[in-house]
Structure formats: C-alpha cells, structure tokens
C-alpha cells in the first residue's frame, strides 16, 4: 500500500506547487488570478503594511496545531483593524477616577462597516501594547454590559518586562453580541485582578494610549499603536457564495 | 496516487483490525497480551469499574480534536485517582472561618504513591461535584503557595441548573510542583470572584464533601464523591523503555 | 566559467542531460519531456495523444467513478463531452469552452479533433470525435446512439425519451 | 516529531517534511500577491510501512508503530500535522486587501 | 464535515469515515481486556482527487478543493482528522489497571 | 501572443495635435493598466502617462500635464494618447506598453511611432 | 521627482566578461526597480522586475540586486546579443522615472 518505487522528488514539487495555485485562488473564490489593471503604481499603503504585520505576528505567536476546519474556515479571511475610540471622547468622562482600571471603546458604526453581518466574523481579538512593567501584575478583562455593569470576560498574568509587549485577547463573541446589537458605542475595561482578601488593588501596567499618569486622563496616542480590534471575518460577497454552495454537502 | 478500482473493504477492514491488534499491545508496550493467570474470579472492583466510569466520563466530554502527539503521549496512560483529605483533618482548622472560599487538601505522599517521579505525570485533573445552584456564579481557583499565600490558577463561570455536576479543572502544572516539593500536605482553594468594587463575595455553589452550612465544618462525605485528582501517568516501568528508546529519533 | 554540469551530476536528472552554457546550464529532456521554464529541470509533456480516463462532470461527490471512457486523448475527451481527464482520479479539468486554452486544445471547436497524421496542404486535417464509438454505452444507455458532425444522437424505444443529464433514456411517466 | 527541525537536518528516508519554498513569482507567475513575495509551505513525503502484527509480537516490531502507524491504519499515509495561515496581501481593484489563508504552512508531518 | 453523522448517513463513495466496530473477543480472540468488550474504531476510506489546477480555472472545480484537497497535498490521502481516546481496564497479574489510550476511535475523516 | 501595435505618428506643426492609438491583441485588454513611454532620437527614455485597466484612474509625467490626455476604449482594445499644443522638445518615437502587474513593470512593448513637431 | 543615476554611461567589454551596471536613486524605493534592454531601432525589453526578479524567458546570465537606494545588473557572462543599452526604472512613486541609460560596447 506503501510504494517503494524511488520517489521522482521534483516530480513531488511540481504538483505540490500547482496543488497549491488552486488552492489559494480556492480559499480566496477566485476563478482565476485578479485582475491587476487597477492597482496604482508605489508601494503598499502604511496602514495596510502596518495591518499585515499585525497579522503576520499574530501568526508567528500562535501555536502550530491543526484544527478540524469547517467548511468556512477554509475559506480566506479579511483582516481589518478598528482603533478605540480616543481618550479624549467624552464617552470616557464618567470613568476617569479608577486607580485599578482603564476603559476602551469602540465605535460600533467602524467594527459594522469592517463586518456588515455578527455571522461573518470569524476572529475578534483586542490588541494593547503594554509598556514595560515593574511587577507581576495579575489583570482581567471585563465587557460593558448594562447600564453600569461589567461582565467578566477573561484574565493574564503579566510577567514583568523591560520591553514593550502586545498583549492579545480573544473577544470574538462579544464583538459578535455588539454587532447584533444597536448601540453606538462598547466598552471593555481592564482591571487589575481584586483578590477577596487583597487591599493593593492598583493596576500598575502601562497600555500605550493612556498617560502614564492617572489612567484615563487624556492620553497621547503614540501614533496607530493604541488599543485596537484586530477582526477576521468572510468578505460579505464571499458569504453569499458560500451560502448559495451549501448544497454540495 | 488514488485508485479507482474497486476496493476490497473486507480486506481493508482485516488489516485496520490487526493494525489495531499491534496498535493496542505497543501503546501499552506489551510484547504479547498479558497473562490472565493470576486474576482472581468475579467482577472488577467497585473503585476500579467507578475510575474506568470516571474516565469514560471524561473522554465524552472532551472534544475531539487530533492533537499533535509527542512520542510519550501515544503510549497508554495509567489512570488512579486521590481522594482529599477528609474535612476533619487538622489542617482545615485554620481556614474555617471564611464564607467566600471552600479549601482542599491532599496528602503528597499518596500521590507520589500513584505518581513516582514528576515527570511520568501527563495530565492531573482537580475533580468536583457541584451540587444544585440557584444563581450564576463565578468562582476562582487558587493552589497553596507559600505560608498563608495563594497563587490564582483559573476561574468558571457556573450556570444555575437543578442537577448536580462533574467540574474539572486542569492542575498539571500544579501537581508536577508538588510531587516535586518536599510537602506533606498540599492544598486548592475554590472561591467566589471578587470583583474590586463588588461587596457580596459569598461562595453560593455547594460542592459535595463539605456540609452546606458553613462551608469547613465537619462534612459529611457522600461516598467516594468527595473532591478528589484524576491522575494521568505513564507507568514507572514503561517509563524506563521509554528513555531506553530515546536513541531512535 | 563554472561547469554546473560536472559539479553536480544530478542536475537535469532522471529524465534529461544536463549541457553547460557559460555562466549558466540547460537541460537537454528526453523524448516525453520539456524542459522546465527555467530551463534548469525536466517534466512530463502531457502528449495530446497520451490515452487516458475521461470524467463527465465535477458536479457529482463521486466523479471520479463518472467515468466515460477509459482509454482517450485529451482532445477526444475535453473536445467533446468531458470535463475532465487524467487517471487513477488524478484529474486534469477541461479548460473552459471559449477561453484560450480550450482554442488551444481544440483549434477546431467543439466535436473535432486535429489528425496529425492527415496533413492538407501543411495544416492538419480536423476529424469529427465519434462519441457514440468512445462513449457509446455510457452517453446512451438503453438508446441507440447515431454519430452526427459534430455531435451525436440517442434514439430511444417508444414510450422513452432521452434524458441529457442522466445521459440515458428514460421511461415517460404517463 | 516529524518537524523542521528533525527532518530539515536529517537523511531520513520514512516520512518527514519536506522543505518547499514558492515564490509567487517564479514557481506561480503570479504577480498579483504583494506580500508576501513567498513563503515555506513545505510538503510532507516519505513512506509509512505496514506492519502486519502477529499476537507473538516482539518489541522491536512494536516499537515501529509509534512512527509508522501510530493510527492502526490499513492503509497508513505521511500526512501533515501541525499546519500555521499565511497572511497576504493583493489588490481588489484600486483596494488593498490583508487576507488570511488557513493552514497554508506544513511545519510538521506523521504517519496516520 | 466528514463524520461519522454525515458518513454514516450517506452513501460517500470518496473520502468518509466508515463503520467499524471491534469486539475485543470475537475480533482479536482477547480475553484479557475486562472493560470495554470493544469499541467503535472506525476508519478512513476513500479516494481524494488530485486536481491538475489551470489557472483558467472556473468556480466548479475550484469548489473541489475544500473537501478534496484543502492541504494541496502533491497526493492527497484520507486521514483521521478527530479523535477520542479509550480506556480499558485490564489485569496485570492480581492487579487491574485502569489505562486510557490516546488517539483510538475516529470520529471524522478528511483529505490531507 | 501579444502584440501592441501603435499609429498616428508623423510630422506636425508646434501648438497643433495628434492622436496616437494602439491597437492590442492576444491578452485580455481591460484586465492591464496600459502607458506610453517616448524616447527623444538619441536620448534615453521618458515615461509620459498611464491609465489604469478601467479606464477610471490616469498619471502624468509633469512636462505633459495639462497638454496630453490618455484613454482607452476596451470593446476596441485600444488605447490613445491626444497630444495638444505639442512643442518641438516633444519630438520622440512614441511606444506604447502594457503594465503587466501591481509592480508596474512594462513586459510588453509596441514597435514604436515617430512624431516630429517641426515648423 | 525621484532622480536615477545610472554608472557608467557606457562601458566596453568581451564576450564571456562578467559586467555589472549600477543605479542609485535620489530616495529609497524599496524594491520598486526594473531594468530594461534596448537595442538600436528596437523597442526596449523588460529583463528584471522588483529589483531582483527575471522576467519569463530572459536568460539567466541576467540578474538582479539591491534594495532601498542603491541597485545592481548583472551579466554573468557576456554573449554577442548582449551588446545594447541598458536603463533602470523606478515605480515606487508618479512621476515613474527612467535612469538615463548604460550602453555596454564591443571591446
């Protein structure tokens, strides 16, 4: 069942290469090869290098394990980025006073525009460069929920480092809720993590768009480097042909 | 480099069994079935048959995905488990007093009994019956750490249901320390999350073992239902074969 | 100048000779084989007349068990009905009707094949694909099949009429 | 493992990954992909035996399941086993586009 | 997905995980496994088409990929994708052993 | 195979114009960005203007800006360059080429057509 | 505008010499190069795109380095149809510029 023939290796290459130029004009619905008659002339645009290298360490940070693939995850994903909304909105007014958090929101017209239906998205992750940091700090991250009530989402130990880091975390499922839902703007806030029995309480991390002095205040965003969404999701014309394909199996 | 005759699937099923049959004997690195001289007459024990059930359990709830599988995770497991200490042990004395924690411990040496040396340990889970609960709840799980110290592990967030349920943790990393530790007694704490600025932090969730008074007193133990580890370990002498046959790759 | 070809001797290897150029090399292929674009490898000429399995269609889970024919060219196959071709279910899809490569493959349109062995004042003769003779019992089952330029037809018992999907004929439901 | 970097520094014959870089341009005729202008996707190769077990096994012959069949297959295939995406780049008309594409980097293989 | 749901249920001539239950008895003539008396193995079947690509290509035959060759394997084969594990319980002379073996019942199939 | 074939050169008078067309065959016309590139008689080359496939975007070299329009009409693979107010520093063979990628390098190349503007 | 010197403007050489034409720009470009060939009364001819790559079916005496400001043409090995005029052509940024040229002589 096994052949012992030698094995022509550029033979081997050869289909694995034409394998692969079906595979990617696949993954990406093309019939064939776009057409590139519009493209202007110069090099890639900042904030799409700026995006791609997002994604590209992104990719480089995450563990090389095969998942079972539904028939969506085949198919290729868009990748966007929406920034948070900047410190000096006035939304961020009535959370200024908190030494154990910091507050980040987001326009929920740019996360539409970047995925017009909640079923689209494939990936949400809020990204935030953490500055260097003294001690271990233990932080959690939680989603505007009600009126004035937070919901728990998840939580990270942060070693302490002289570098600054991105730190990445999986809210695919909440900006899913956002999209379904009519409000303008949402929330996350990060705190540090309150032990029952703990008194120290304050969140001693830097995220780089917030002033490193009382958090909250208005900020210097240090270029397109503050808190951002990072969202994968099947381009709108994609999802209509894979839903018209349905039938195949 | 797929073939279009007819198949044999009588023959492809003869040789899928006989794979398993050598499959079988060399994950348990047997090199022939095990002699059936000794076993005594009658049925399996009743803790052997409720650890079998306890690991059947398990493998239904898990999900089924191929993990890429380092050469010692595809020889079999040995599966024991250790129940905590009973609640009327000394060592609860002084952790009596709090409503917003429940604490368990275990006895090392019983664990070094099941599990020689940290490094044949490939999977330890803390095991608890959640009795009914009338509300959300989200709790915390801490390992004794130092002195009067505890170290935050992970966290859940229990739905309300009528029937009671298996919760597991995973506490690998946990139980390898302590079968490298010179400890007698090694303990978790489970814990309502305190968020910094709520003030009700009362562990609601009962959990079978410790009366539903308060939680610490002298419990009464409902059979083998007590919080207990499920440990995963590679035998101690199929360990030795093991490194013996490093050599090969 | 460094001879590429005697520093290493598998170049151009198992199926051509390596030749040295200055500053550069080629392979010389042998009989079935062109060289690749760089001119530095050798692979397979899929040859017009090589015969192999022709597939009716791609929209069935199973096609590589819709099967026409076992032992065409891939003109004869993607000229006439086929939309694929190759063997052991390794599969060639017919190019498009009406792209390039379909011209190219079948200068003559669809129903023809070029005759490389008639030549009419030095172009090849065209010769109408005869489907009934290669696909017959596949394209017209329970019919008889009548070879037409180009085309075919199926003729079908009374009380049956021809069915262009299911390429048979079929009971009419009175 | 069967990874880079057991297979990509040794001989071994059975089955490994194999090392395949593709350059959009050269290896596709692509000009279409801006970023990146390649990458490793590797390929996996190599013969996994069968081994018909007897009841008298020994252990030489058990040992060769792990690599050769761990699976217990009847028909046993070097496959890929960890895969990472690959992001890219490619216009839209006049509009950019980062998109990923699953599962695009053989990093490792086995015998399944 | 290739599953045993959809496999089970359809009559996939291609690439599908089939039906095989192993009676540790009757199968192996094994006595000495005490718990389970055997189990649902199942296996892979069934050929993965390897599409010569153009790049003309036309949506159809693209849409082969994803379930025929989505790893654009030079050869692709059918593999196990998910897997469960199975406990046994057996006696090594007067003491039972409860052990768990990884990676025994496949559940779905897929072409890689 | 390609082939660009350009015409409409000749001789004219300083602050007339000339239309240049080209005429494209063996490729698929409105999936290429297309340009015109001149060449002074023994000088080097000058990039003079380029429209994308659709027609929808146009870039000019500064000393034809104002003066020289590009177009294309797709159903008739062709494309143009209308020179008004030509002056005697434009006197070059004109050749047209097709952009072949985002990298907008020039991979195929017509044979070229002479304009002199002369009193 | 970005500006692109070419050196030398001329240079002579034997059949099987190993020549090399430089380009440096007024700015860094990336990669956003190509070189082209040009005989006498002949359109020119695309040899290398994005500094380093040969376009299908130029020999592979041709190749091409360099990135950001500073890039090279080479000729591994000299052949008679070689003799011609060579340009570098930027397309980081409108207007795209053209390098005034090498003409590589008979010796």
């Known amino acids: 069942l096994s052949t012992c023939k030698t094995i022509d290796m550029e033979l081997v290459k050869r289909k694995r290469i034409e394998a692969i130029r079906g595979q990617i004009l696949s993954k990406l619905r093309l019939a064939s090869p776009p057409s590139q008659g519009e493209v202007p002339p110069g090099p890639l645009p900042e904030a799409v290098l700026a995006l791609y290298n997002s994604t590209r360490d992104r990719v480089a940070g995450e563990s090389a394990e095969p998942e079972p693939e539904p028939e969506a995850d085949y198919y290729a994903k868009e990748v966007t980025r929406v920034l948070m909304v900047e410190t000096h909105n006035e939304i961020y007014d009535k959370f200024k006073q908190s030494t154990h958090s910091i507050y980040m929101f987001f326009n929920t017209s740019e996360l539409r525009e970047a995925v017009p239906e909640p079923v689209l998205l494939s990936r949400a992750e809020l990204r935030l460069l953490r500055l260097k940091l003294k001690v271990e700090q233990h932080v959690e991250l939680y989603q505007k929920y009600s009126n004035n009530s937070w919901r728990y989402l998840s939580n990270r130990l942060l070693a302490p480092s002289d570098s600054p880091e991105w730190l990445s975390f999986d809210v695919t499922g909440v900006v899913r809720q956002w999209l379904s839902r009519g409000g303008e703007i949402e929330g996350f806030r990060l705190s540090a993590h309150c032990s029952c029995d703990s008194r120290d309480n304050t969140l001693q991390v830097d995220i780089n768009g917030f002033t490193t002095g009382r958090r909250g205040d208005l900020a210097t965003i240090h270029g397109m480097n503050r808190p951002f969404l990072l969202l994968m999701a099947t381009p709108l014309e994609r999802a209509q042909h894979l839903q018209s394909s349905r039938h195949r199996r | 480099l797929s073939t279009c005759k007819t198949i044999d699937m009588e023959l492809v099923k003869r040789k899928r069994i006989e794979a398993i049959r050598g499959q079988i004997l060399s994950k348990l690195r047997l090199a022939s079935p095990p002699s059936q001289g000794e076993v005594p007459p009658g049925p399996l024990p009743e803790a052997v048959l409720a650890l079998y059930n306890s690991t059947r359990d398990r493998v239904a709830g898990e999900s089924a995905e191929p993990e890429p599988e380092p050469e010692a995770d595809y020889y079999a497991k040995e599966v024991t488990r250790v129940l905590m200490v009973e609640t009327h042990n000394e060592i609860y004395d002084k952790f009596k007093q709090s409503t917003h924690s429940i604490y368990m411990f275990f006895n090392t040496s019983e664990l070094r009994e099941a599990v020689p040396e940290p490094v044949l340990l490939s999977r330890a889970e803390l095991r608890l019956l959640r009795l009914k609960l009338k509300v959300e709840q989200h709790v915390e799980l801490y390992q004794k750490y130092s002195n009067n110290s505890w170290r935050y592990l992970s966290n859940r967030l229990l739905a309300p249901s009528d029937s009671p349920e298996w919760l597991s943790f995973d506490v690998t990393g946990v139980v390898r320390q302590w079968l490298s530790r010179g400890g007698e007694i090694e303990g978790f704490r489970l814990s309502a999350h305190c968020s910094c600025d709520s003030r009700d932090n009362t562990l609601q969730v009962d959990i079978n073992g410790f009366t539903t008074g308060r939680r610490g007193d002298l419990a009464t133990i409902h059979g083998m239902n007590r919080p207990f580890l499920l440990l995963m370990a590679t035998p101690l002498e199929r360990a030795q074969h093991l490194q013996s046959s490093r050599h090969r790759r | 100048d460094i001879d590429e070809c005697s520093q290493d001797p598998s170049l151009c290897l198992p199926h051509g000779a390596c030749k040295n150029l200055q500053g550069s090399y080629v392979c010389v292929c042998d009989e079935g084989f062109t060289p690749t674009q760089d001119q530095h490898g050798c692979e397979e000429v899929e040859q017009p007349h090589h015969k192999k399995e022709c597939y009716l269609n791609f929209d069935d889970t199973v096609f590589c068990d819709s099967v026409l024919a076992t032992n065409v060219t891939q003109q004869e196959c993607c000229c006439s009905l086929g939309a694929g071709w190759g063997d052991h279910c390794e599969i060639y899809p017919c190019p498009v009707y009406s792209s390039a490569e379909f011209h190219s493959l079948c200068p003559d349109g669809k129903g023809y094949t070029q005759d490389n062995n008639i030549v009419n004042y030095g172009i090849p003769a065209h010769r109408d694909i005869d489907e009934c003779m290669l696909f017959g019992s596949e394209i017209c089952k329970e019919g008889k099949c009548v070879n037409t330029q180009p085309g075919y037809e199926c003729y079908c018992k009374q009380g049956f009429y021809y069915d262009g999907n299911l390429l048979e004929c079929v009971d009419v439901d009175e | 493992a069967l990874d880079t970097n057991y297979c990509f520094s040794s001989t071994e014959k059975n089955c490994c990954v194999r090392q395949l870089y593709i350059d959009f341009r050269k290896d596709l005729g692509w000009k279409w992909i801006h970023e990146p202008k390649g990458y490793h996707a590797n390929f996996c190769l190599g013969p996994c035996p069968y081994i018909w077990s007897l009841d008298t096994q020994y252990s030489k012959v058990l040992a060769l399941y792990n690599q050769h069949n761990p699976g217990a297959s009847a028909a046993p295939c070097c496959v890929p086993q960890a895969l990472e995406p690959l992001p890219i780049v490619y216009y839209v008309g006049r509009k950019p586009k980062v998109e990923q594409l699953s599962n695009m980097i053989v990093r490792s293989c086995k015998c399944s | 997905a290739l599953d045993t749901n959809y496999c089970f249920s359809s009559t996939e001539k291609n690439c599908c995980v089939r039906q095989l239950y192993i009676d540790f008895r009757k199968d192996l003539g094994w006595k000495w496994i005490h718990e389970p008396k055997g189990y649902h193995a199942n296996f892979c079947l069934g050929p993965c088409p390897y599409i010569w690509s153009l790049d003309t290509q036309y949506s159809k035959v693209l849409a082969l990929y994803n379930q025929h060759n989505p790893g654009a394997s030079a050869a692709p084969c059918c593999v196990p994708q998910a897997l469960e594990p199975l406990p046994i319980v057996y006696y090594v002379g007067r003491k039972p052993k409860v052990e768990q073996l990884s990676n025994m019942i496949v559940r779905s199939c897929k072409c890689s | 195979q390609v082939q660009l074939v350009e015409s409409g050169g000749g001789v004219v008078q300083p602050g007339r114009s000339l239309r240049l067309s080209c005429a494209a065959s063996?490729?698929?016309?409105?999936?290429?960005?297309m340009t015109w590139v001149r060449q002074a008689p023994g000088k080097g080359l000058e990039w003079v203007s380029a429209?994308?496939?659709?027609?929808?975007?146009?870039y000019f070299a500064d000393s034809v800006k104002g003066r020289f329009t590009i177009s294309r009409d797709n159903s008739k693979n062709t494309l143009y360059l209308q020179m008004n107010s030509l002056r005697a520093e434009d006197t070059a063979v004109y050749y047209c080429?097709?952009?072949?990628?985002?990298?907008?390098?020039?991979?195929?190349w017509g044979q070229g057509t002479l304009v002199t503007v002369s009193s | 505008d970005i500006q692109l010197t070419q050196s030398p403007s001329s240079l002579s050489a034997s059949v099987g010499d190993r020549v090399t034409i430089t380009c440096r720009a007024s700015?860094?470009?990336?990669?956003?190069l190509n070189w082209y060939q040009q005989k006498p009364g002949k359109a020119p001819k695309l040899l290398i795109y994005?500094?380093?790559n040969l376009q299908s079916g130029v020999p592979s005496r041709f190749s091409g380095s360099g990135s950001g400001t500073d890039f090279t043409l080479t000729i591994s090995s000299l052949q008679p149809e070689d003799f011609a005029t060579y340009y570098c052509?930027?397309?980081?940024?409108?207007?795209?510029?053209f390098g005034g040229g090498t003409k590589v002589e008979i010796k």
């Open positions: 080429a097709r952009v072949s990628s985002g990298h907008w390098d020039f991979d195929e």
């Open positions: 063996g490729f698929t016309f409105s999936s290429f960005a």
């Open positions: 429209i994308s496939g659709s027609g929808a975007a146009t």
């Open positions: 700015q860094s470009i990336s990669s956003y």
């Open positions: 994005a500094a380093s």
């Open positions: 052509q930027q397309t980081y940024t409108v207007p795209l510029t």
